[in-house]
């Protein structure tokens, strides 16, 4: 649930976390031939005042952080989201059982920031 | 606090919310001449399964949503963040009390999505 992630005290600042995703776990093993999985990674952490340059905060996120300080019930903190994403190439079967090599964009998190 | 935003039951799907920001409220009235404020807006809402086309989810966010379903304690849901941002032009005093017109990028949220 979302409540697993609501404690500022326990959360570190927004950053990239490592995550390997198995296509079998997603139930995609019947159509994806290769790879068996990939390092997808994910973003998590607080975007709290004071922000710093390591947090890759957009100007809007900076403004939103200041508004959140004044109105925490009304405006949420910015969220920790990917700032750089990479593609992966996947070998798969199409509807006609042909083997296709396709590049899927925005599959791997390379960097995170406050947005 | 972050806990103000942790109830899935109360939250609608990820979308843009209207927000007007006054530069006086931010304490910037001494250097910004005009405008007095601007429509910054912000993103908020759930990025829950099932995602749909209105949520502008990246491929990574789709994968992360599925992983979250299997491991909710380990991997968070994707977050609702700006997908399109606009600049604003600001008239301000520089160090030498000259009046300058400057365009600040990524200040206004135009659209939101799951990231």
């Amino acid at each position: 649930s979302a409540s697993d992630y609501n404690s500022s005290e326990l959360k570190t600042a927004c950053r990239k976390h490592e995550l390997y995703v198995s296509f079998q776990d997603l139930g995609w093993q019947d159509w994806i031939i290769a790879p068996k999985g990939y390092a997808a990674n994910y973003c998590d952490g607080e975007c709290s005042f004071p922000l710093n340059a390591h947090m890759n905060a957009t100007n809007h996120a900076i403004v939103q952080t200041l508004v959140h300080l004044m109105n925490p019930e009304y405006v949420p903190k910015p969220c920790c989201a990917p700032t750089k994403l990479n593609a992966i190439s996947v070998l798969y079967f199409d509807d006609n059982s042909n083997v296709i090599l396709k590049k899927y964009r925005n599959m791997v998190v390379r960097a995170c920031g406050c947005h | 606090s972050a806990s103000d935003y942790n109830s899935s039951e109360l939250k609608t799907a990820c979308r843009k919310h209207e927000l007007y920001v006054s530069f006086q409220d931010l304490g910037w009235q001494d250097w910004i001449i005009a405008p007095k404020g601007y429509a910054a807006n912000y993103c908020d809402g759930e990025c829950s399964f099932p995602l749909n086309a209105h949520m502008n989810a990246t491929n990574h966010a789709i994968v992360q949503t599925l992983v979250h379903l299997m491991n909710p304690e380990y991997v968070p849901k994707p977050c609702c963040a700006p997908t399109k941002l606009n600049a604003i032009s600001v008239l301000y005093f520089d160090d030498n009390s000259n009046v300058i017109l400057k365009k600040y990028r990524n200040m206004v949220v135009r659209a939101c999505g799951c990231h």
Epitope: N52, A57, L66, L69, G113 | L26, G27, W31, D95, R105
Partner: nanobody, 121 residues
Framework: EVQLVESGGGLVQAGGSLRLSCAAS????????MGWYRQVPGKQRELVAA???????NYGDSAKGRFTISRDNAKNTVYLQMNSLKPEDTAVYYC???????????????WGKGTLVTVSS
Amino acid sequence: EVQLVESGGGLVQAGGSLRLSCAASGSIFSIVSMGWYRQVPGKQRELVAAITSAGSTNYGDSAKGRFTISRDNAKNTVYLQMNSLKPEDTAVYYCNSYGLGYPGDYGIDYWGKGTLVTVSS
């Protein structure tokens, strides 16, 4: 560019007080917040306290209840009043300013050179 100059560091006995000052000059108009961080050799810089232009503050765990941050917008100066100092407060204290990103996409940090605070027991 923003230039930051710290002053007020020095040697003080445990239980004593110090007041650090940080004067900002240069492109100060786009500064969003100013603050103090500290670092001891071999450890990461940690937040002591920060303050926005509107006066909102945040304190690191080590500073709560003992340190107070304030700012004088007219003088472009931020202060850190440190009371009930302990030997473990010994560190180099750095002034930080954080501003809107221009012309780039992300916010920008500026740092002072640091001022040494030594608390003897």
